[in-house]
């Protein structure tokens, strides 16, 4: 039974506007038509789900309307963007990929991307 490898960058620095993007790539052992991608955040051994999307190969990823994630897919590659991040959201963001259909089912978990978020300094008052 083949394994499914999931690759993601080790470190990403969020922009000053609290946006972080990274690629989650999976080596598909089969010809999946339905794929589920989940992003989890691990901090201090606590794991929480950040967002999840199921998509049909060749179609766009659709996250829930209130999700902080957006993404696009191209082949076995998913480009993920997480927005609204603050310094307290710094942590390890894990990409989990599931090949839902057709059988057999496959699951792969990436090593995680450490996202660093630095809150911008407030603008000093200017005296004119």
């Amino acid at each position: 039974c083949k394994a499914m490898h999931v690759a993601q960058p080790a470190v990403v620095l969020a922009s000053s506007r609290g946006i972080a993007s990274f690629v989650c790539e999976y080596a598909s052992p089969g010809k999946a038509t339905e794929v589920r991608v989940t992003v989890l955040r691990q901090a201090d051994s606590q794991v929480t789900e950040v967002c999840a999307a199921t998509y049909m190969m060749g179609n766009e990823l659709t996250f829930l309307d209130d999700s902080i994630c957006t993404g696009t897919s191209s082949g076995n590659q998913v480009n993920l963007t997480i927005q609204g991040l603050r310094a307290m959201d710094t942590g390890l963001y894990i990409c989990k990929v599931e090949l839902m259909y057709p059988p057999p089912y496959y699951l792969g978990i990436g090593n995680g991307t450490q996202i660093y978020v630095i809150d911008p300094e407030p603008c000093p008052d200017s005296d004119f």
Epitope: A3, H5, L40, Q42, V47, E49, I94, G108, I109, G110
Partner: nanobody, 115 residues
């Protein structure tokens, strides 16, 4: 090195119950998924159920209603309670562990449902 040790298989009559256990040894990531696959003679290896360290559970259709997966994170052990067993549940059952960037298989445990 991570190792998985399974137990609890055996011969049971139709309608009976079995509880499979799988214990992981070695260092594993705090986020992980443990689960069970099964392979009947001449068939492919299929997922039965899995459970993540944060409690998220997934069941295959064939397992819903009769099988219950649970885990003890402190013991790094996953359990599969199988009730109302049928002859078609006869298979080799494999434990699987997914950790960050890797996965591992257990050896195997035979489950035979027969009168």
């Amino acid at each position: 090195e991570v190792q998985l040790v399974e137990s609890g298989g055996g011969l049971v009559e139709p309608g009976g119950s079995l509880r499979l256990s799988c214990a992981a040894s070695g260092s594993i990531s705090s986020y992980n998924v443990m689960g069970w696959y099964r392979q009947a003679p001449g068939q492919q290896r299929d997922l039965v159920a899995h459970i993540a360290s944060n409690g998220e559970i997934m069941y295959a259709d064939s397992a819903k209603g009769r099988f219950t997966i649970s885990r003890d994170n402190a013991k790094k052990t996953v359990y599969l309670q199988m009730n109302s067993l049928k002859p078609e549940d006869t298979a080799v059952y494999y434990c699987k562990l997914w950790v960050l960037g890797n996965d591992y298989w257990g050896q195997r445990t035979q489950v035979t449902v027969s009168s």
